[in-house]
Amino acid sequence: AQNITARIGEPLVLKCKGAPKKPPQRLEWKLNTGRTEAWKVLSPQGGGPWDSVARVLPNGSLFLPAVGIQDEGIFRCQAMNRNGKETKSNYRVRVYQIPGKPEIVDSASELTAGVPNKVGTCVSEGSYPAGTLSWHLDGKPLVPNEKGVSVKEQTRRHPETGLFTLQSELMVTPARGGDPRPTFSCSFSPGLPRHRALRTAPIQPRVWEPVPLEEVQLVVEPEGGAVAPGGTVTLTCEVPAQPSPQIHWMKDGVPLPLPPSPVLILPEIGPQDQGTYSCVATHSSHGPQESRAVSISIIEPGEEGPTAGSVGGSGLGTLALA
């Protein structure tokens, strides 16, 4: 079959090869499209409601005055010339619609380095077939799920026209010390070949570099974290940042079920209080930051306590404050 692509709403003429140029003609068109149930036969005599959709012209060609999505399918013509020789024509018709120029909506004017940011949402309306949206950074294609790039896509179909609306939301994590004014654009690639991509106007958000946080200091009293049974340990979490962040406490890597407080008092220490404690400062703008961990231990009378109760600063691990 010969592949034919036709733009929605435009006329289409399909030639019936081998047909005499003028009547009388012995020919028949067979259609299997979205408008038909199995095969529909059209003859030069025509007439009836089909004439508004497709009719046979005097030269035997099939004329569709305005192609629609339902006209996609197979068109066959069987013609016999004056000498009785039979010729068959076979067409596979596909339709398309070029959407309006895609647009970036809800675009960010500023991104924060080192954390995921929504750049914007690319919208293309009125395509057929659906086609695809892709993002570009400084003219180069961005690959989702690589280097802090994620894309959330949505495709909707108009209930009446059957045309597609595509949406693509771009999230990126700009590298610290990277380009302070990256250029993002989005392009629509049609679902049918031989049609060029349509590109949005570019956007150039600023990249803001957060000032590195000063370290969260965990102060233990008594120093070293070793205490006699029944003694009291006071843990204080010192964060230089303003405004003061929320401070939660961890024991052995697990959040303690307490409200935020910069001070944790452990009175009358018993064996069950022994363990590794740390504090987590949660800033509204930076996310959680954990202190070094300190080891709280009980020293029996006559024992020498360790000189330092700290263990290496642990990462956040599976931090999920309820």
């Epitope: 024991k251 959040p255 079920p257 409200p259 935020p260 407080s261």
Partner: antibody
Framework: EIQLQQTGPELVKPGASVKISCKAS????????MLWVKQSHGKSLEWIGN????????FYNLKFKGKATLTVDKSSSTAYMQLNSLTSEDSAVYYC??????????WGAGTTVTVSS | QAVVTQESALTTSPGETVTLTCRSS?????????ANWVQEKPDHLFTGLIG???NRSPGVPARFSGSLIGDKAALTITGAQTEDEAIYFC?????????FGGGTKLTVL
């Protein structure tokens, strides 16, 4: 509807132990702290301790350390409190309450524990 | 250990505004005490009203509000109703220790 269903009244002998339960329904059990509170007859409320059902981590009022043990069973969305070495001082109504660290919005109906020989 | 003090009893009339307070023996109550207010009705029916000083629990009528007044935590009922007759407990967090007040018996006549 969010509910905390507690076990019925308990009559126990001095020196014995009792384990009371608090079954949560209508919300995600592991998303909230469970808080336990004691109300002695004619007295105010006393905080016993908290448990984080997600991790099983606990924190106790010093007064109840060694007296109360808090546990959870995530599969049945149930929190438990065991009270050991019971004396007449432990006769009270015990409540569980759902908390998101600083709120206690939903409370159980309470479990009355009577310690008597 | 800190002591939390409340009015032992208050009386109001329907439609009136009434304020219950909660004082700390350690000094001024601040937002770091996460003041809570809990209502007890007959038959040991407890409901959390306010948490974190001024956050109303879901489903609690808007006539209940929490605040700090001077150096105390306060619960204000604007337009009291007869069904608000109950005992109201406040609770304050002190770092990692929770202390309840003695409760205020509110009568709505």
């Amino acid at each position: 509807e969010i509910q905390l269903q507690q076990t019925g009244p308990e009559l126990v002998k001095p020196g014995a132990s009792v384990k009371i339960s608090c079954k949560a329904s209508g919300y995600s059990f592991t998303d909230y702290i469970m808080l336990w509170v004691k109300q002695s007859h004619g007295k105010s409320l006393e905080w016993i301790g908290n448990i984080n059902p997600y991790y099983g981590s606990t924190f106790y009022n010093l007064k109840f350390k060694g007296k109360a043990t808090l546990t959870v069973d995530k599969s049945s969305s149930t929190a438990y409190m065991q009270l050991n070495s019971l004396t007449s001082e432990d006769s009270a109504v015990y409540y569980c309450a759902r908390s998101d660290y600083w709120y206690f919005d939903v409370w159980g109906a309470g479990t009355t524990v009577t310690v008597s020989s | 250990q800190a002591v939390v003090t409340q009015e032992s009893a208050l009386t109001t009339s329907p439609g009136e505004t009434v304020t219950l307070t909660c004082r700390s023996s350690t000094g001024a109550v601040t937002t770091s005490n996460y003041a809570n207010w809990v209502q007890e009705k007959p038959d040991h029916l407890f409901t959390g009203l306010i948490g974190g000083t001024n956050n109303r629990s879901p489903g609690v009528p808007a006539r209940f509000s929490g605040s700090l007044i001077g150096d105390k935590a306060a619960l204000t009922i604007t337009g009291a109703q007869t069904e608000d007759e109950a005992i109201y407990f406040c609770a304050l967090w002190y770092s990692n220790h929770l202390v309840f007040g003695g409760g205020t018996k509110l009568t709505v006549l």
